[in-house]
Interface confidence: medium
């Protein structure tokens, strides 16, 4: 359903959105897979407390998603 709330991004997905342009821009020859691998290495080398901003944002989006999906389901119910 195109009207359904969009799927949730993970903390890692949010991190990738932030740093993918830099990796791609600085290394234009890298394949999509290599860019993903580099981002994965960066994320894995990041301490838990440094991942917090992304985890907090992902949790906020999850909260919003749950509210949106509840509203969407309620809207879809017949009277």
């Amino acid at each position: 359903d195109p009207n359904a709330p969009k799927r949730l991004p993970s903390a890692f997905f949010l991190f990738c959105s932030e740093y993918r342009p830099k990796i791609k821009g600085e290394h234009p020859g890298l394949s999509i897979g290599d860019v993903a691998k580099k981002l994965g290495e960066m994320w894995n080398n990041t301490a838990a407390d440094d991942k917090q901003p992304y985890e907090k944002k992902a949790a906020k989006l999850k909260e919003k998603y749950e509210k949106d999906i509840a509203a969407y389901r309620a809207k879809g119910k017949p009277d």
């Epitope: 932030e18 600085e26 960066m42 080398n45 990041t46 301490a47 440094d50 992304y54 944002k57």
Partner: antibody
Framework: EVQLLESGGGLVQPGGSLRLSCAAS????????MTWVRQAPGKGLEWVSS????????KYADSVKGRFTISRDNSKNTLYLQMNSLRAEDTAVYYC??????????WGKGTTVTVSS | DIQMTQSPGTLSLSPGEGATLSCRAS???????LAWYQQKPGQAPRLLIY???KRATGTPARFSGSGSGTDFTLSISSLEPEDFAVYYC???????????FGQGTKVEVK
């Protein structure tokens, strides 16, 4: 040439506000984390705040948390530091810096902030 | 939070002598996130060494960095007149970065 140029420093009374700007040129500003570092007269370097490439994520030193706000305008290639409730201990040279290749390898010349009555 | 402690506070040496500057982290840190900077009066800091031992562009070969875990060292094999300055070690936390500087070591002319 990669360059950072700070402006907006000056003399301000305790409790006052000031907004620092840092104009970036010579690189794709929107790809990079940006950082403010300060140095009080005769003292060492102190990290103040950093912001992610999109501006969506920020970090602050405990000494400025709740008083300073870092932001950026990627369309203008400009970094900002809004400083409120200024104290005498905020008197320093404020440097704008970024990791162009590795670590903080590009620095501006700094702008001086003096908090005094 | 990780603290970086540098020693000595001041090093008095003559040109031509070697210098050893120490930096100790309050807990083990990855050498990937350890750097050294040089600062001269009235100037912005300049990156010398990153990843504990890699020389930044323009850093002369007489500068070398070493160490791992909690103990790191910046060595200058033979001091040139332009090397008399303040040196800072620094640790980086990631995304967006948070930087912790040591208090600095001043290398002065004896």
């Amino acid at each position: 040439e990669v360059q950072l140029l700070e402006s907006g420093g000056g003399l301000v009374q305790p409790g006052g506000s000031l907004r620092l700007s840092c104009a970036a040129s010579g690189f794709t500003f929107s790809w990079y984390d940006m950082t403010w570092v300060r140095q009080a007269p005769g003292k060492g370097l102190e990290w103040v705040s950093s912001i992610s490439p999109s501006g969506g994520y920020t970090k602050y030193a405990d000494s400025v948390k709740g008083r300073f706000t870092i932001s950026r305008d990627n369309s203008k290639n400009t970094l900002y530091l809004q400083m409120n409730s200024l104290r005498a201990e905020d008197t320093a040279v404020y440097y704008c810096t970024t990791e162009f290749y590795d670590y903080l390898d590009v620095w501006g010349k700094g702008t001086t902030v003096t908090v005094s009555s | 939070d990780i603290q970086m402690t540098q020693s000595p506070g001041t090093l008095s040496l003559s040109p031509g002598e070697g210098a050893t500057l120490s930096c100790r982290a309050s807990q083990s840190v990855s050498s990937t996130y350890l750097a050294w900077y040089q600062q001269k009066p009235g100037q912005a800091p300049r990156l010398l060494i990153y990843e504990a031992s890699k020389r930044a562009t323009g850093t002369p070969a007489r500068f070398s960095g070493s160490g791992s875990g909690t103990d790191f060292t910046l060595s200058i094999s033979s001091l040139e007149p332009e090397d008399f300055a303040v040196y800072y070690c620094q640790h980086r936390h990631n995304w967006p970065p948070q930087w912790t500087f040591g208090q600095g070591t001043k290398v002065e002319v004896k």
